[in-house]
């Protein structure tokens, strides 16, 4: 496969793997996060269930090479794509749920990236050019965000507050960004 065959958009889906939507070159600024530091009471939403954990959001894993101009990563990276219907987990089928479970005039829920992580990648370049080292931004986790129909369509609301980021040396919270767990997954991808 020639170098010219690689996409110049930092993505290259590996043949034979399921092809999921490609991440954008630049992250779009269309997410309004609404979080509080170190606790705080989440806002009451009449259509929410009592337990936030009941809401499910599909996290699809896919593996790809990343490219930077003519240069391509030496190894593929595995990341998440946030996809599928967002809704109470008990109502979501195994396949991507398409059933509208919400009430009329109720809120929509969108599955979007929650946290990002960095992964070091070595990029090999054609023509004997020096290799490059980059840190690629990957989605680390997805979350359901509430889109209130009565408000501006772009207004996304969180279920509730989150605490501050952990300090080095302390164990990260499950939802904190981290690459260590994903590294093993990447190594096992091939």
């Amino acid at each position: 496969q020639g170098w010219q065959a690689f996409k110049n958009d930092a993505t290259e889906i590996i043949p034979g793997l399921r092809e999921y939507p490609e991440p954008p070159q630049e992250l779009e600024n269309n997410q309004t996060m609404n979080r509080a530091e170190n606790g705080g009471r989440p806002p009451h939403h009449p259509y929410d269930t009592k337990d936030v954990s009941e809401y499910s959001c599909r996290e699809l894993h896919y593996t790809r090479f990343v490219t930077d101009g003519p240069c391509r990563s030496a190894k593929p990276v595995t990341e998440l794509v946030c996809s599928g219907q967002c809704g109470p987990a008990r109502l979501l089928p195994n396949a991507i749920g398409r059933v509208k479970w919400w009430r009329p005039n109720g809120p929509d829920f969108r599955c979007i990236p929650d946290r990002y992580r960095a992964q070091r990648v070595q990029l090999l370049c054609p023509g004997g050019a020096a290799p490059r080292s980059r840190k690629v931004r990957l989605v680390a986790s997805c979350k359901c965000k509430r889109l209130t129909r009565f408000h501006n369509q772009s207004e996304l609301k969180d279920f509730g507050p989150e605490t501050a980021r952990p300090q080095k040396g302390r164990k990260p919270r499950p939802r904190a960004r981290g690459a260590k767990a994903n590294q093993a997954e990447l190594e096992n991808a091939y």
Epitope: Q25, L27, M33, S133, R165, Q167, K180
Partner: antibody, heavy 121, light 109 residues
């Protein structure tokens, strides 16, 4: 476009603490990796610490370990740097700096205007 | 902790070429140190010129370029302009911990 606006100048006594804020606009804090850098008058830049997206943790420079705390209020997209047990040598301009939320992590792309902290008895 | 070294001062003639270097006390600087270069003028916040060894930014003038040279990170200025007179800092990434060099005062004379 990421923009950072820092709190105003502070004058503190030795032994006191100072808390500098850095308000983010254009993106949300959770999309960014925030770092803090200081510069004493007539001296060079000194990295104090910041969020490492590889580990998902905040890392502090050894020199400031135990004296600095970096926190974030994601409800207001404001980052804070608190330095305690101040001494005269902590007199400096304190900067917050962040990446540009691009596909590749490029740190220190956007800088706040700086906050002058003067420690004097 | 690692020490990052730079030339304290350098002078270049207008239109001339100059190379600033950045070394590490831990050994050779490599692409895995993701070298950064910053320019700072008096009374201003620093601004990034180069990231990840050689990656320029939209605001970086074409006359600036980054590279690795003899085990050090290098910033080359080709065709110096009077407005390039400033302090230049390099920054190295030691696995998430960053260390700035002492800075190079560049004079365009």
């Amino acid at each position: 476009e990421v923009q950072l606006v820092q709190s105003g100048a502070e004058v503190k006594k030795p032994g006191a603490s100072v808390k500098v804020s850095c308000k983010v606009s254009g993106y949300t804090l959770t999309e960014l990796s925030m770092h803090w850098v200081r510069q004493a008058p007539g001296k060079g830049l000194e990295w104090m610490g910041g969020f490492d997206p590889e580990d998902g943790e905040t890392i502090y420079a050894q020199k400031f370990q135990g004296r600095v705390t970096m926190t974030e209020d994601t409800s207001t997209d404001t980052a804070y740097m608190e330095l305690s047990s101040l001494r005269s040598e902590d007199t400096a301009v304190y900067y917050c700096a962040t990446d540009s939320a691009g596909y590749w992590y490029k740190f220190f792309q956007h800088w706040g205007q700086g906050t002058l902290v003067t420690v004097s008895s | 902790q690692a020490v990052v070294t730079q030339e304290p001062s350098l002078t270049v003639s207008p239109g001339g070429t100059v190379t600033l270097t950045c070394g590490s006390s831990t050994g050779a600087v490599t692409i895995d140190h993701y070298p950064y270069w910053f320019q700072q003028k008096p009374g201003q916040a620093p601004r990034t010129l180069i990231s990840d060894t050689d990656d320029k930014h939209s605001w970086t003038p074409a006359r600036f370029s980054g590279s690795l040279l003899g085990g050090k990170a290098a910033l080359t200025l080709s065709g110096a302009q009077p407005e390039d007179e400033a302090e230049y800092y390099c920054l190295l990434d030691y696995g998430g911990t960053f260390v700035f060099g002492g800075g190079t005062k560049l004079t365009v004379l």
